[in-house]
């Protein structure tokens, strides 16, 4: 049977579905159709996603074309880039996969273009007129979780029929997105309907445990139960698990509740949720989320140090003022020579000393996230003169409530009087926090902007603004990009450095199509007032623990600080893009750094850097900085772009007033 004559069909994984709609539509109509169903046009950015699309599309006719979510405005070609100046309908240009039918050829790109995928052969990407009604379109739907397809039961009259939230009905799904309905018909008559729902203990699962059809009780095959089978009075059987295990979503098998590592530090089976979380010494459960552990700030305990105290993740250290040295108890100070000393009170039994190997030192270093605490009566630095360097840190004072995130240098005591301005390298390592000086710690910032939490709709993993993983080859720090968030090995996440954050403007309802010539929607553009760029500021680096959870259930992990970031000269590693060419089905193309979009193209117009504003284009669910398709409209505007899935190269001129490399956003775009 010709699938093209049939109903829409889809293929789902644990976190997203692709759906093929064999309906003739223009690009704009297809985009709207996907949006109305709660999705977006397909954005196959990786070879794995492309494989799922390939499997879904199958071997169609050569004459058939399907829209995917790539669009380019007139005169926006960037032929040296993997996407050639095209932008995903989710608002970014990041990709680890391309499948262009032809090599890029020079030209002025005079017209808006959209991308369609060939239904036959290699499913190559072709560009063409966005107003052409092609044969169909591919939508992508992200969701919070998925339920596995139900196992067939002995008493079933036929396979379960599933209906997804985006209205596709099939018996063929392997995974069912959250919100799907399963209809099971039983041979004995009555059937059952199940809903893929959020479970109280987290995750998603079917609303009812099996078996669903009345059978012969527990006798055959233990009723399908992994552990214990119980025959209920109504003839149903229900499954139970032995102590320390809980019933899985399928209602039959049993799982270790700690297997999915629901706790940040220590997990024990038992308790109302099937497990309970515990924190290591030096940590306590977070008030808002008992799964998470936060550092206990021992420096807040009166008398923990005689003079000065610095708290860090999992412990604290005492310091003495100039002319005093720390006694053996690590707390008291006694008169001594000119150099101070410090003792480590690492409650996690990870005491550092100079004899430890560099790797351990790095790990402890990455875990550090504390704040200086001055013990009463000792004023050791004048608050009115913050040092003039990028991460301009200073100690905390009673009247100061700004976040403090110093990174003390690991082997030297802190400065005991106002320090000189230290040398600050403009190249930052991707693998560890910024250590500004070889001899001094950095000090808490006098100009730290407040953290603005990101407000977001519930997004799928595919569509969240992700933490940019530091998945670079091992490079000397001079070759690492500077403006990046960094994923770290597992470590307690307490006292994180300031998160980068941007508040998104109001979202469009799914059925609106703002910013079209015929559709004027008021109040959709938000202006963010950005603070002035202080001189000689280096980039902020967000270090995130691997287990750092989002601050709110729907908030993405990465936050972008609402401040202008200067551009730093760095030698960039290349981003590898998997590309299928007409010659070979798939091969890796290493794209030079110069071809990559900027990491954080925070725009620096050629004007005074004070009171700058940056229009942020409206967003929608399942998107980064989405754009609305539009056939025609005004000239491009500059806008603040957020980084997205893959690490991308930063622009290279420090403090440039006008950057040719910056991508110009066009409010006609999706």
């Amino acid at each position: 049977q010709d699938p093209w004559a049939a109903e829409p069909r889809s293929a789902c994984g644990p976190s997203s579905c692709y759906a093929l709609f064999p309906r003739r539509r223009t690009f704009l109509e297809a985009w709207r159709a996907c949006r109305e169903l709660g999705g977006d046009l397909a954005t196959p950015r990786t070879p794995e996603e492309a494989q799922r699309v390939d499997n879904l599309v199958g071997a169609g006719p050569a004459s058939r074309l399907l829209w995917i979510g790539l669009q380019r405005q007139a005169r926006q070609c960037q032929l040296q880039r993997p996407l050639r100046g095209f932008t995903w309908t989710t608002g970014d240009q990041d990709t680890a996969f391309t499948n262009w039918a032809q090599p890029a050829t020079g030209g002025p790109c005079p017209a808006q273009r959209c991308v369609a995928l060939e239904a036959s052969g290699e499913h190559r990407w072709l560009e063409g007129s966005c107003t052409l009604a092609v044969d169909g379109y591919l939508c992508q739907f992200g969701f919070e979780g998925a339920c596995p397809a139900l196992q067939d039961e002995a008493g079933q009259a036929g396979p379960a029929v599933y209906t997804t939230p985006f209205h596709l009905v099939s018996t063929e799904f392997e995974w069912l997105p959250f919100g799907s309905v399963a209809a099971v018909q039983c041979q004995a008559g009555r059937g059952a309907s199940l809903l893929c729902v959020k479970q109280p203990e987290g995750g998603v699962g079917w609303s009812r445990a099996g078996p669903l059809c009345l059978g012969a009780g527990c006798s055959p095959d233990n009723g399908g139960c992994e552990h214990e089978c119980v025959e209920e009075v109504d003839g149903h059987v229900s499954c139970r698990c032995t102590e320390g295990f809980r019933l899985a979503a399928d209602g039959r098998s049993c799982e270790d509740p700690c297997a999915q590592a629901p706790c940040e530090q220590q997990c024990e089976p038992g308790g109302p949720q099937g497990y309970s979380c515990h924190c290591r010494l030096g940590f306590r459960p977070a008030e808002d989320d008992p799964h998470r552990c936060v550092d206990t700030d021992e420096c807040q305990i009166a008398g923990v140090c005689q003079q000065m105290c610095v708290n860090y993740v999992g412990g604290f250290e005492c310091y003495c003022s100039e002319g005093h040295e720390l006694e053996a108890d690590g707390i008291s100070c006694s008169p001594a020579g000119a150099m101070g000393a410090r003792a480590s009170q690492d409650l996690g039994d990870e005491l550092l000393d100079d004899g430890e190997d560099e790797e351990d030192e790095d790990e402890a270093w990455e875990a550090f996230g504390g704040g200086w605490t001055e013990m009463p009566g000792i004023l050791w630095m004048e608050p009115t003169q913050p040092p003039d360097f990028a991460l301009a840190y200073r100690p905390s004072f009673p009247e100061d409530r700004e976040p403090q995130i110093p990174y003390p240098e690991p082997t030297w005591p802190p400065p005991l009087s106002a320090p000189r301005v230290p040398y600050h390298s403009s190249v930052l390592s991707v693998t560890r926090p910024v250590v500004v000086s070889a001899t001094r710690p950095t000090l808490p910032s006098a100009h730290q902007p407040p953290v603005i939490p990101a407000t977001h709709p519930a997004l799928s993993r595919d569509h969240q603004i992700p933490v940019i993983a530091a998945n670079y080859p091992d490079l000397p720090s001079a070759y690492q990009p500077g403006i990046l968030s960094v994923s770290h090995p597992a470590q307690p996440p307490a006292h994180q450095p300031p998160m980068i954050s941007t508040r998104y403007p109001e979202l469009f309802p799914a059925h609106q199509s703002p910013m079209f010539p015929d559709t004027q929607v008021a109040g959709t553009q938000t202006t963010t007032h950005l603070p002035a760029i202080p001189p000689n500021r280096a980039p902020l680096v967000t270090t995130l623990g691997a287990h750092q959870p989002p601050q709110a259930p729907d908030a993405p992990v990465l936050r972008t600080q609402a401040t202008q970031l200067p551009i730093i000269p760095t030698a960039q590693p290349s981003l590898t893009t998997s590309s299928r060419s007409p010659v070979s089905p798939a091969h890796q193309v290493s794209v030079p750094a110069a071809t990559q979009p900027p990491a954080l193209p925070t725009l620096l117009p050629s004007q005074s850097p004070t009171n700058q504003t940056s229009p942020i284009s409206p967003t929608h669910p399942h998107s980064k900085v989405p754009q609305i398709p539009r056939e025609d409209g005004p000239s491009p505007k500059l806008a603040l772009w957020l980084p997205s899935a893959a690490p991308t190269a930063a622009p290279t001129a420090l403090g440039e007033a006008s950057l040719a490399e910056h991508i110009q956003r066009d409010d006609r775009w999706l």
Epitope: W4, R64, L65, L126, G128, S129, C130, L132, E631
Partner: antibody, heavy 124, light 108 residues
């Protein structure tokens, strides 16, 4: 090379039917849609409809609906167009044309190859 | 239906001249426009597709431009074999193709 060869001229009386053929060669017949276009004397070109050899899908111009039928003989790589209830204003040259799929990495629905045309004269 | 109007209907020019033919659509057709050349007793030949892309084998003196509702076919330096009738075609509401009325290019 790609070729579309059409059947010879026809003279018909009003009310009669005409069936013409278009034989394709030089490409995979089922990969490309065949359109029919006509041109009356001194007139502009007028689209009549298409047939997709992949799945026999047809779409006709409303103006000809009920009078036109497009069919295929896939084994002979041939498309047919029949027009019924002929009138004098149906006197025209009838072309079959192949719709392109893509050229040099672009998708496009323009007509890249045309038959030489079949002249149909409707006269009493 | 989308209407296409070409201008001029007739054009007299000499070999070596630069000539421009315009085509106006009654509504936005994006770039789904093609240009064809037709000589007497012959079938049309594709010159330009997608408004501005030259078809394989078409001489570089032929160029197309425009998007939305206004389109142009330009012949930069007329050759003797270029004297013919030129048609624009839109296919934005595919499969409903419509053609312009044609522009006859004659030798002056």
């Amino acid at each position: 090379q790609v070729q579309l060869v059409q059947s010879g001229p026809e003279v018909k009386k009003p009310g009669a039917s005409v069936k013409m053929s278009c034989k394709a060669s030089g490409y995979t017949f089922t990969d490309y849609v065949i359109h029919w276009v006509r041109q009356g004397p001194g007139q502009r070109l007028e689209w009549m409809g298409y047939i997709n050899p992949y799945d026999d899908d047809t779409t006709y111009n409303q103006k000809f609906k009920g009078r036109v039928t497009m069919t295929l003989d896939k084994s002979a790589s041939t498309a047919y167009m029949q027009l019924n209830s002929l009138r004098s204003e149906d006197t025209a040259v009838y072309y079959c044309a192949r719709r392109g799929n893509s050229y040099d990495g672009y998708f496009d629905y323009s007509m890249d190859y045309w038959g030489q045309g079949t002249l149909v004269t409707v006269s009493s | 239906d989308i209407q296409l109007t070409q201008s001029p209907n007739f054009l007299s020019a000499s070999v070596g001249d630069r000539v421009t033919i315009t085509c106006r659509a009654s509504q936005n057709v994006g770039t789904a426009v093609a240009w064809y050349q037709q000589k007497p007793g012959k079938a049309p030949k594709l010159l330009i597709y997608s408004a501005s892309n030259r078809y394989t084998g078409v001489p570089s003196r032929f160029s197309g431009s425009g998007s939305g509702t206004d389109f142009t076919l330009t012949i930069s330096s007329l050759q003797p074999e270029d004297f013919a009738t030129y048609y624009c075609q839109q296919y934005t509401n595919y499969p409903m193709y419509t053609f312009g009325q044609g522009t006859k290019l004659e030798i002056k």
